[in-house]
Amino acid sequence: LIIGFGISGKHFITVTTFTSAGNIGEDGTLSCTFEPDIKLNGIVIQWLKEGIKGLVHEFKEGKDDLSQQHEMFRGRTAVFADQVVVGNASLRLKNVQLTDAGTYTCYIHTSKGKGNANLEYKTGAFSMPEINVDYNASSESLRCEAPRWFPQPTVAWASQVDQGANFSEVSNTSFELNSENVTMKVVSVLYNVTINNTYSCMIENDIAKATGDIKVTDSEVKRRSQLELLNSG
C-alpha cells in the first residue's frame, strides 16, 4: 500500500496505490484510488512507467487521450471510465507481458489539487495445481500438475500424517517449456503414498504460492486447490 500526497497551491489530494502482480498473457489491473471529484471534465489521470518515454495511459476531459502513449502499451490499456468520478483511477492492462514489470506512477489532477503515488508491478506466470492419483505408476503415486509458471518455481510435498517429513527423495519434479517459450508446465510425482492420508503439493516462486491438497480413502478422493499472490497490497 502506497499513499502519495500532492500540493497544488494550498490544495493536495491523497492518491493510493497497491503493489500487485500480473499473470503473463492474462489481463491485469494496476490499482489506484484518489479523493473523488464530481467534475469529471476536470479530472486528469496519467499513468507513467519508470524508464519509458511517453505515457502508459492518459484520461482527461472525460475520455481517453493516447496521443502520447508509448507503443508497447498500444491497444492494451483502459481506465474504468464510469468509476473515475468516484475516485477510481485503476488501469486495466490487456495481455500482460513479462516486460510490463516495473515501477508505475499514478498521477492525478483534479479541481481539488494534484497528487501521485508509485506502485511496483511484478509479472510472471502462476496457475492452480491439480493433483491426481497416478494409476500408471508401479506403486501408488500422486501426480501434481500446474500448466503455467514463471519464473521457475520450487515444488515441495507435505503430508498431514508425516508432518515435517522430507519427500524430496521420493518425488520427481520436471519443468516443461510451453509453446510461447516463456512459461513452463510443472509436473511433480510423489511415489509410495499411503491411503487415508492428506498430501499437499506446494508450488512457489517470488510472485505466487499455490497449494493443491488431495485426500485418498478407500471410498473417495477429495481435492482442494488455492493460490495466493505474494507481497501484494
Partner: antibody, heavy 121, light 107 residues
Framework: QLQLQESGPGLVKPSETLSLTCTAS??????????WSWIRQHPGKGLEWIGN???????YYNPSLKSRVTMSVDTSKNQFSLKLSSVTAADTAVYYC?????????????WGRGTLVTVSS | DIQMTQSPSSVSASVGDRVTITCRAS??????LAWYQQKPGKAPKLLIY???SLQSGVPSRFSGSGSGTDFTLTISSLQPEDFATYYC?????????FGGGTKVEIK
C-alpha cells in the same frame, strides 16, 4: 450517429499504389477513445486486418503487409487513409474502414460499406 | 500470429433450430473474442464482444461463451434473417486475426 464511408479508385494497375480514404460523418475521429482500422476481404474469402491508426497519427500495421502499408489521418477533414504499394492481383479485395470499440477492446463496432478494389492491367 | 479455426465451415439448418458454431484459438486469448455476422454484399456486423457480451441492438437469441482457446456462438432459435456467414475474431494480440467463417444455410 457516426458513419464511415470508403472512397478511392476501384481499379488499380499491378505494381502501382492503392489509395483509399475513409470519411467519418456524424462524429469526430479525434475522439480519443477509439482506434481506426482498415480490414480487407478477398473475393469469397475471410477477413484480414491491415492495421490501425490513432487520431494523433500513430499507427500499427499487420506485419504481413507492413513493408507496403502507409496509413495517415487528417483530423481537419475527419478522414483517415490507406496506401498499399506495389500491388498485385492478390490485393484484389473489398476494403473496409472500421472503428475499434474502445482503446482496449479491439473489436469493430462500426464499419464502412466497403469498396471493391480490383488490381488488373 | 494467432490462428483462429472455426467449425463447421458450413451448416444447414431450419428456422427455429438451435445452431452452435465453435472457434478455437491457437493460443490462449483470455476472453478477447468477438463474433460477427455478414450477409452477401454487406459489411460485417458485431454481434458479441468480450466472448459473451451482447452488442447493443443485437437480439438475445445470440449468445457467446468460452475463454482461453475454445469459444462458442449459439443462436438459440434460428430466424430467417439469421442465414448469413459468421466470423470470430481475436482481439488479444497484434495482429488481430479472424476465423475462416461459418456459413449458415437454409436446409
Amino acid at each position: 450517429q457516426l458513419q464511415l464511408q470508403e472512397s478511392g479508385p476501384g481499379l488499380v494497375k499491378p505494381s502501382e499504389t492503392l489509395s483509399l480514404t475513409c470519411t467519418a460523418s456524424g462524429g469526430s475521429i479525434s475522439h480519443g477513445g477509439y482506434y481506426w482500422s482498415w480490414i480487407r476481404q478477398h473475393p469469397g474469402k475471410g477477413l484480414e486486418w491491415i492495421g490501425n491508426i490513432y487520431y494523433s497519427g500513430s499507427t500499427y500495421y499487420n506485419p504481413s503487409l507492413k513493408s507496403r502499408v502507409t496509413m495517415s489521418v487528417d483530423t481537419s477533414k475527419n478522414q483517415f487513409s490507406l496506401k498499399l504499394s506495389s500491388v498485385t492481383a492478390a490485393d484484389t479485395a473489398v476494403y473496409y474502414c472500421a472503428r475499434e470499440s474502445s482503446t482496449i477492446s479491439a473489436d469493430f463496432d462500426l464499419w464502412g460499406r466497403g469498396t471493391l478494389v480490383t488490381v488488373s492491367s | 500470429d494467432i490462428q483462429m479455426t472455426q467449425s463447421p465451415s458450413s451448416v444447414s439448418a431450419s428456422v427455429g433450430d438451435r445452431v452452435t458454431i465453435t472457434c478455437r484459438a491457437s493460443q490462449g486469448i483470455s476472453r478477447w473474442l468477438a463474433w460477427y455476422q455478414q450477409k452477401p454484399g454487406k459489411a460485417p456486423k458485431l454481434l458479441i464482444y468480450a466472448a459473451s457480451s451482447l452488442q447493443s441492438g443485437v437480439p438475445s437469441r445470440f449468445s457467446g461463451s468460452g475463454s482461453g482457446t475454445d469459444f462458442t456462438l449459439t443462436i438459440s432459435s434460428l430466424q430467417p434473417e439469421d442465414f448469413a456467414t459468421y466470423y470470430c475474431q481475436q482481439a488479444h494480440t497484434f495482429p488481430y486475426t479472424f476465423g475462416g467463417g461459418t456459413k449458415v444455410e437454409i436446409k
